[in-house]
Amino acid sequence: AVNGTSQFTCFYNSRANISCVWSQDGALQDTSCQVHAWPDRRRWNQTCELLPVSQASWACNLILGAPDSQKLTTVDIVTLRVLCREGVRWRVMAIQDFKPFENLRLMAPISLQVVHVETHRCNISWEISQASHYFERHLEFEARTLSPGHTWEEAPLLTLKQKQEWICLETLTPDTQYEFQVRVKPLQGEFTTWSPWSQPLAFRTKPAALGKDT
């Protein structure tokens, strides 16, 4: 038997993926566990194998269909169970009735690219991935820029309160290496959270022209 406190958290990416993390103090490392999804009104069900992400937590992704297919709606309730093998039987370790559109976390923005760079400014664009058509253009973004000698945690957050898939960074230092990240969040859902940060985009501002004021 496995004792200790257990936490089972899942998010829906708004299209065809439910990602889950299960943590259990005192859990057995060599136990085989999985997440099972059973919707209340759909003909499919789905399973994924929990894989370790740290000493006492496991994660997996329930792939519900093609990446851009709309597999769930606001009225769906999905019973999610953590099942662990005990000998020849499966034991239910955790269970929740999951409301997908109350627990949203979109995929991280992708395809970050520098559109135009100058000495003091840089225009960057990105794309969102696998976001439901239900949101239309009603999404918000947060962005941050890593300056030399600083950490990501120290970087001020820039908020974009609309679906604007570009930003113009200003007051940059010439001939300097920077990194940029962005994340996205829908407006809907009581327990909705920010997407993971995008992969960082590295860029360098242009050097100041010699003999000119900058």
Partner: nanobody, 119 residues
Framework: QLQLVESGGGLVQTGGSLRLSCAVS????????MGWYRQVPGKQRELVAD???????KYADSVKGRFSILRDSVKNTVYLQMSSLKPEDTGIYYC?????????????WGQGTQVTVSS
């Protein structure tokens, strides 16, 4: 102004049929579910049938095999085909639509249409 307009209610004999319809019109929206609920005096409003995106229909046990729901997502209209009607099907039938407006989801209700099944 957003509106849900119901029609098709009326008085019918036991064993007869009726077809209810409900159309949503008005401001910009996307519907992800539409359905029918009924209310009888002194009781809570209860689900009769609904249909969500992806074609998943849900029916109350008491109407399975007798009622059929059809949703036209292009016209934003939902129909309820009721056959083999019984006196216990009598009540006010309300249309409900789950609508996405400006990135948020809300439920909207029609005014209701009376269905009376006489024995």
């Amino acid at each position: 102004q957003l509106q849900l307009v119901e029609s098709g209610g009326g008085l019918v004999q036991t064993g007869g049929s009726l077809r209810l319809s409900c159309a949503v019109s008005g401001s910009r929206f996307i519907s992800d579910v539409m359905g029918w609920y009924r209310q009888v005096p002194g009781k809570q409003r209860e689900l009769v049938a609904d249909m969500a995106d992806g074609g998943s229909a849900k029916y109350a046990d008491s109407v399975k095999g007798r009622f059929s729901i059809l949703r036209d997502s292009v016209k934003n209209t939902v129909y309820l085909q009721m056959s083999s009607l019984k006196p216990e099907d009598t009540g006010i039938y309300y249309c409900k639509a789950g609508l996405w407006i400006a990135g948020r989801h809300s439920d909207y209700w029609g005014q209701g249409t009376q269905v009376t099944v006489s024995s």
